[in-house]
């Protein structure tokens, strides 16, 4: 806090307020300010061998103000504290200390972590993620039609990034296997990207099975396409319902 200092007026008679300048209410030639105007703080400033009274609009850094009916004075903060409201309530600690609930600590208490930027003890923040977004349309090489096995993806957002000691974020991407809509592609539909088509609920024929996301698991290989008769398809549908493997991107 910058202190605006009341200049002292040289006067022959102590305790005579007439002619005192700055924030002084009363002053003397030898001692400077003896008392201050309302809302100003009295402080002693050493000049050479003598102490001079000054009136400040706010206490200098490292001091706090205390009010009394006759005088407002500046008092030093605790040794480990740079700025404070009082001796029990520090607002900024000296280098090497961490601020927590108005106190300066060498180390942060359990359950809190040191923020070396603000030099404060802060709560450990764990990752928070949103609900999953809906599955994307089932596609195979960009097509949303045909008889081919494809993939569909869903994502969720990170709402709160974790702090240094916080729990890491769970996966934010999931991909699984599915069967592209069982209908022949129209001429205009060939190669049309899934995201360009309206999202539709899966048809009865669309079977879904979670598979590794090739982006997150480079080693995963594509399963060859198979033509299936109706009996095989029914059998697969039952199996697919029982599978729920999902591979995801971890943040």
């Amino acid at each position: 806090q910058n202190a605006s200092r009341g200049r002292r007026q040289r006067r022959m008679h102590p305790n005579v307020s007439q002619g005192c300048q700055g924030g002084c209410a009363t002053c003397s030639d030898y001692n400077g300010c003896l008392s201050c105007k309302p809302r100003l703080f009295f402080a002693l400033e050493r000049i050479g061998m003598k102490q001079i009274g000054v009136c400040l609009s706010s206490c200098p850094s490292g001091y706090y103000g205390t009010r009394y009916p006759d005088i407002n004075k500046c008092t030093k903060c605790k040794a480990d504290c740079d700025t404070c409201f009082n001796k029990n309530f520090c607002t900024k600690c000296k280098s090497g200390f961490y601020l927590h609930l108005g106190k300066c600590l060498d180390n942060c208490p359990e359950g809190l972590e040191a923020n070396n930027h603000t030099m404060e003890c802060v709560s450990i923040v764990h990752c928070e993620v949103s609900e999953w977004n809906p599955w994307s349309p089932c596609t195979k090489k960009g097509k949303t039609c045909g008889f081919k096995r494809g993939t569909e993806t869903r994502v969720r957002e990170i709402i709160q990034h974790p702090s240094a000691k916080g729990n890491l974020c769970p996966p934010t991407n999931e991909t699984r296997k599915c069967t592209v809509q069982r209908k022949k592609c129209q001429k205009g539909e060939r190669g049309k990207k899934g995201r360009e088509r309206k999202r539709k609920k899966p048809n009865k024929g669309e079977s879904k099975e979670a598979i590794p996301d090739s982006k997150s698991l480079e080693s995963s290989k594509e399963i060859p396409e198979q033509r299936e008769n109706k009996q095989q398809q029914k059998k697969r549908k039952v199996q697919d319902k029982q599978k729920s493997v999902s591979v995801s991107t971890v943040h």
Epitope: F41, S58, R67, N88
Partner: antibody, heavy 117, light 111 residues
Amino acid sequence: QVQLVQSGAEVKKPGASVKVSCKASGYTFTSYTFHWVRQAPGQGLEWIGYIYPSNGDSGYNQKFKNRVTMTRDTSTSTAYMELSRLRSEDTAVYYCATYFANNFDYWGQGTTLTVSS
Amino acid sequence: DIVLTQSPASLAVSLGQRATITCKASQSVDYDGDSYMNWYQQKPGQPPKLLIYAASNLESGIPARFSGSGSGTDFTLTINPVEAEDVATYYCQQSNEDPLTFGAGTKLELK
């Protein structure tokens, strides 16, 4: 004389943010810390935090720490308090006050915030 | 946090009588010989107004019928004699520790 004039009433939806201002006059803006206190309807007073106008240092009640930000503009002698991720429980009158030697001696007129869907 | 318990929650006093409100802190609010306890008055639709600072000092411009006393954990606000304009809610507040806290308030009414 010292005067603190706050911005007008606000109505917000849950999840939104609000920024309340407090313009000071009648004294040197950087001389005293600014504090923010709130009062829910029919309830008592609750301290939110403070800012030193001289250097912008701020500190918050742990209860609000992850949702509140206090700033100031020395050129206009204005202090600001922003509260994010609002919920219905944040419906209250928000006051700014100057802090002089461990007490709140001047207060703004209050800003009513209503959080409702 | 320092919890401040005010009593009574409400008080009905006749004009000209004495009103006494107490505030009990969950731990001492004294340090280095100073008591970091303040009292405020709040009327409906208005911000609080400082009455007493440092437990017993009267804020300038406040009538002398208001007085404060106490130290450590027990503090008292006295209004004597009560006047019609004193109808309000009164709060104690400690500045000794982070976070700063207020009492729940005492509502003063006239009998």
